[in-house]
């Protein structure tokens, strides 16, 4: 607790004091009072700096002193030997000594009393702005006429802050203008004006005459304006040296003049008007503005359209123009908002063709699409060129907006078939001469791939087994192999409706319409070892001709064994029906005048035993186009026989694509159409 | 008809190599694919290899790489299987099996030919 | 290499009973698998090929199903002669591999 006044003994004071002896005093008086501290015997053993014993008066951290040795007053009628006068409320006493001493001290006894101090005078800060009253115990500031005391006791100003201006014209000026302005004071004035509208403020430099800055060029007292999140200012000086008109942007302006304790001058005197809020002509890149005026203000609107083959993106929706609005913030609404190129996006892919990775994807881009050559071609045409559209379509020039179709090129085969030595009397074969092979393994047979969903095979290869299981793009029929290939599964057959199913067909003599489709489950990917024979064309120039050769490929029975397991290809010449019919049938079901010859049959081979035979049925009798050399075309079908080794009958293929045509028309996928 | 007669039994010693051989009749050896399938004594089937004629190469199993070899003589239409570094383990009937089409895996078997390994 | 499970190892049964043994393969084998019977000091015997189609001369008391890794050999009626050792073959890569072989033997 403060007190008034006390005293300090040094330890067994007056008795000697004890060696290594270290004890302190706090004094605290009232706050607002001093402290006279005062010793009245002081006998501590003598050293250098008092190093030995001594008695430390410290106040905060400043030591105030250090006593030993002995003394004695100077006056006769004053006890005190020694004292100290310290301006503040509390301070420490710290007596000390060491392991010995060479006589016997009695230490010292010391009073303090608290002494009032003198707050106006006494301290190097001044702590009023105007008149400073001292009392005992404490003080307090005062105010000349006209000024009141701050709410921290200690500064006086003018009471000039609080003013609201709302009025779209108005004058404001600092206190008492033209005469000097009050010294010490922060003024603040507010305008506030309606929103949409900018507090635009004009002043003469002569209205304007504000104490000057410092050396360093900082405004001893100033004139600041403050908009939302912009500044101008502080201005001082004679004259005003910012610009006499000052477009705030804002429809809130404040104020502030704040003043030092000396140099008053004359102070300033200003204008302020409201302006509806200016937004800017904004650059707005690959657009159009409309209605387009000089200047557009508070409530304006435009309607802002894109160029050809720019658009606004907003979220997903892409749109052609939008409206801004000229807010009362001074900006746009929908400012965000661009007129940007199209974007087309990525290209879509398409089935067996491919399309470059783009450079852009933007408006005026040109992609091309291109199909697995050799294997697949363009239908559709159109060169495969698209550019990127305005409208944020892929298109191109012939197709427009649609996609180009890669679909299989025919009749091609990778490697032309060359006879090597005189099916029976053939030559062995590779898939890559009649990629359009395919292998049927019960009954095993064989079939012609004619495009990428379609199988045409012969019927009675199919009558039996509804659901045969084929195989494309392999030489060999060895089991290793054909796990290796690939294996077509059927969603259906059909059967040509001029095709007689029988109960027993081993009894068979008649093999009118012997043709059949398979419609695939899913398409066939072409390559070097799988790509489909053409169909006849219908003009005449697809009339066979008897001498016209064909190929045939398969691998049904040979010479030597039932089966074969590579496949084997003959080139046969087709033949007039009379040389099919002269011929006795090896092993008659029935009398030879009951077997059926029709012109949907044509007869060929009878060249160096060369012939299909058992188990090539369905394959195609290939012939090279009329009129295009490097292509073949299905103009048969195996079909029967009377013997192996002599002419064989084949399916004329030309009297059926009106068939075939119509079956796979009714029978496609939408993606196919 | 296809007919592979194969050499007869034979007793190894441990360390040893054996030649079995296969001769093919009713077929030319060019047309076939051959196989080698052993049997050890009361256990299952193993497949040894083959020699695939499609990309001219003989494919061994991974159990027997390194210790067998299967070659062909076409001249004589005849098939041998080696197997050496043999060990008690290695007593089997060795097989030469045809390859089948059209997903058969097996048409024709050997006799079979029985090796012994023992010290 | 792919590995054939067969199951079960043994089984028995009687003369009329139906059979069914199960090859499960590590992985998709697709329709690549056959079925055979052998019997004591003699060649195994091709009974089924490509899962389920029948190899011409075998009775049809036979037949097989199954697809990708799990596979069924049935016998409906088990016969006298039908006692015998079965083996399950992938042939959809090599290496070709075969099942342990289950043993029908008479209950």
């Known amino acids: 607790e403060p007190t008034m006044y006390g005293e300090i003994l040094s330890p067994n004071y007056p008795q000697a004091y004890p060696s290594e002896v270290e004890k302190s005093w706090d004094i605290e008086v009232p706050e607002g009072y001093g402290i006279h501290l005062y010793f009245t015997h002081l006998d501590i053993e003598l050293s250098e700096n008092c190093a030995y014993d001594s008695v430390q008066i410290i106040s905060g951290d400043t030591e105030e002193g250090r006593l030993c040795g002995q003394r004695s007053s100077n006056n006769p009628h004053s006890p005190i030997v020694e004292e100290f006068q310290v301006p503040y409320n509390k301070l420490q006493v710290i007596f000390k000594s060491d392991f010995s001493n060479e006589e016997r001290f009695t230490g010292f006894a010391a009073y303090y009393v608290a002494t009032d101090i003198n707050e106006c005078t006494d301290f190097v800060d001044v702590p009023c702005s105007h008149f400073c009253n001292n009392f005992i115990g404490g003080y307090f500031c005062s105010c000349p006429p006209e000024y009141f005391l701050h709410d921290d006791m200690k500064n006086c100003g003018v009471n000039c802050s609080g003013d609201v201006f709302t009025a779209l014209i108005g004058e404001i000026a600092s206190p008492n203008y033209p005469k000097p302005y009050p010294e010490n004071s922060r003024c603040e004035y507010q305008i506030r004006l309606e929103k949409g509208f900018q507090v635009v403020v004009t002043l003469r430099r002569e209205d304007f005459d504000v104490e000057a800055a410092d050396s360093a060029g900082n405004c001893l007292d100033s004139l600041v304006f403050v908009a939302g999140d912009r500044q101008f200012g502080p201005y001082c000086g004679h004259g005003f040296p910012g610009p006499l008109n000052i477009e705030t942007k804002s429809n809130a302006l404040d104020i502030i003049f704040q003043t030092d304790l000396t140099g008053q001058k004359k102070g300033w005197k200003l204008r302020y008007h409201g302006d509806p809020m200016p937004c800017p002509k904004e650059d707005t890149p690959n657009s159009v503005w409309e209605p387009a005026k000089a200047k557009y203000v508070f409530r304006d609107v435009v309607q802002i359209t894109c160029l050809d083959g720019f658009e606004v993106v907003e979220g997903r929706v892409g749109a052609t123009s939008f409206y801004s609005t000229c807010q009362s913030n001074g900006k746009w609404s929908n400012s965000k908002l661009k007129c940007q190129p199209v974007d087309c996006g990525i290209p879509e892919s398409i089935e067996n063709g491919k399309v470059e990775d783009p450079e852009s994807t933007l408006f005026g881009s040109v992609i091309r699409y291109t199909c697995e050559e050799p294997y697949y071609y363009m239908e559709n045409g159109g060169g495969g060129e698209y550019h990127c559209a305005g409208n944020g379509s892929w298109v191109n020039e012939v197709l427009g907006p649609e996609l180009p179709k890669c679909v299989p090129v025919c009749g091609v085969p990778r490697e032309p078939f060359e006879e090597k030595q005189r099916i029976i009397g053939g030559s062995d074969a590779d898939i890559k001469n009649f990629p359009w092979q395919v292998f049927f393994d019960n009954p095993w047979a064989g079939g012609a791939l004619i495009n990428e969903y379609w199988v045409l095979t012969a019927a009675h290869v199919v009558e039996g087994n509804r659901e045969p299981t084929m195989y494309v793009g392999s030489t060999s029929v060895q089991t290793s192999r054909l796990a290796k290939s690939k294996m077509l599964t059927p969603e259906h057959v059909f059967i040509h409706p001029g095709w007689k199913l029988l109960e027993v067909p081993e009894g068979r003599t008649n093999f009118d319409n012997d043709i059949a489709l398979v419609r695939l489950k899913d398409p066939v990917k072409m390559g070097p070892t799988v790509s489909p024979i053409c169909l006849p064309g219908t003009s005449s120039d697809y009339n066979l001709m008897d001498g016209d050769l064909g190929l045939i490929s398969g691998w049904g029975r040979t010479e030597k064994r039932d089966r074969a397991v590579r496949l084997k290809a003959a080139r046969l010449p087709v033949a007039p029906l009379r040389k099919c019919k002269e011929v006795k049938v090896e092993k008659p079901t029935a009398d030879a005048e009951a077997y059926v010859f029709t012109p949907n049959m044509i007869c060929a081979g009878g060249e160096k035993g060369m012939d299909s035979c058992k188990g090539d049925s369905g394959g195609a009798f290939a012939v090279q186009d009329p009129n295009d050399k490097t292509k073949f075309y299905a103009a048969g079908l195996v079909s029967w026989g009377p013997q192996c080794g002599t002419y064989g009958l084949y399916t004329r293929v030309k009297n059926y694509v009106d068939w075939i045509m119509k079956t796979m028309q009714e029978n496609s996928t939408p993606r196919e159409d | 008809q296809v007919q592979l007669v194969q050499s007869g039994a034979e007793v190894k010693k441990p360390g040893a190599s054996v030649k079995v051989s296969c001769k093919v009749s009713?077929?030319?050896?060019?047309?076939?694919?051959m196989h080698w399938v052993r049997q050890a004594p009361g256990k299952g089937l193993e497949w040894m290899g083959t020699?695939?004629?499609?990309?001219?190469?003989?494919i061994y199993a991974q159990k027997f790489q390194g210790r067998v070899t299967m070659t062909e003589d076409t001249s004589t239409d005849t098939a041998y299987m080696e197997l050496s570094s043999l060990r008690s383990e290695d007593t089997a009937v060795y097989y030469c099996?045809?390859?089948?089409?059209?997903?058969?895996?097996?048409?024709?078997w050997g006799q079979g030919t029985l090796v012994t390994v023992s010290s | 290499d792919i590995q054939m499970t067969q199951s079960p190892s043994t089984l028995s049964a009687s003369v009329g009973d139906r059979v069914t043994i199960t090859c499960r393969a590590s992985?998709?084998?697709?329709?690549?698998l056959a079925w055979y019977q052998q019997k004591p000091g003699k060649a195994p015997k091709l009974l089924i090929y490509k899962a389920s189609s029948l190899e011409s001369g075998v009775p049809s008391r036979f037949s097989g199903s199954g697809s990708g890794t799990e596979f069924t050999l049935t016998i409906s009626s088990l016969q006298p002669d039908d006692f015998a050792t079965y083996y399950c073959q992938q042939v959809n890569s090599y290496d070709w591999t075969f099942g342990q072989g289950t043993k029908v033997e008479i209950k």
């Open positions: 099996v045809t390859e089948g089409l059209g997903g058969r895996p097996f048409d024709h």
């Open positions: 009713g077929d030319t050896l060019t047309e076939l694919s």
């Open positions: 992985q998709s084998i697709s329709s690549w």
């Open positions: 020699f695939d004629p499609e990309e001219g190469e003989t």
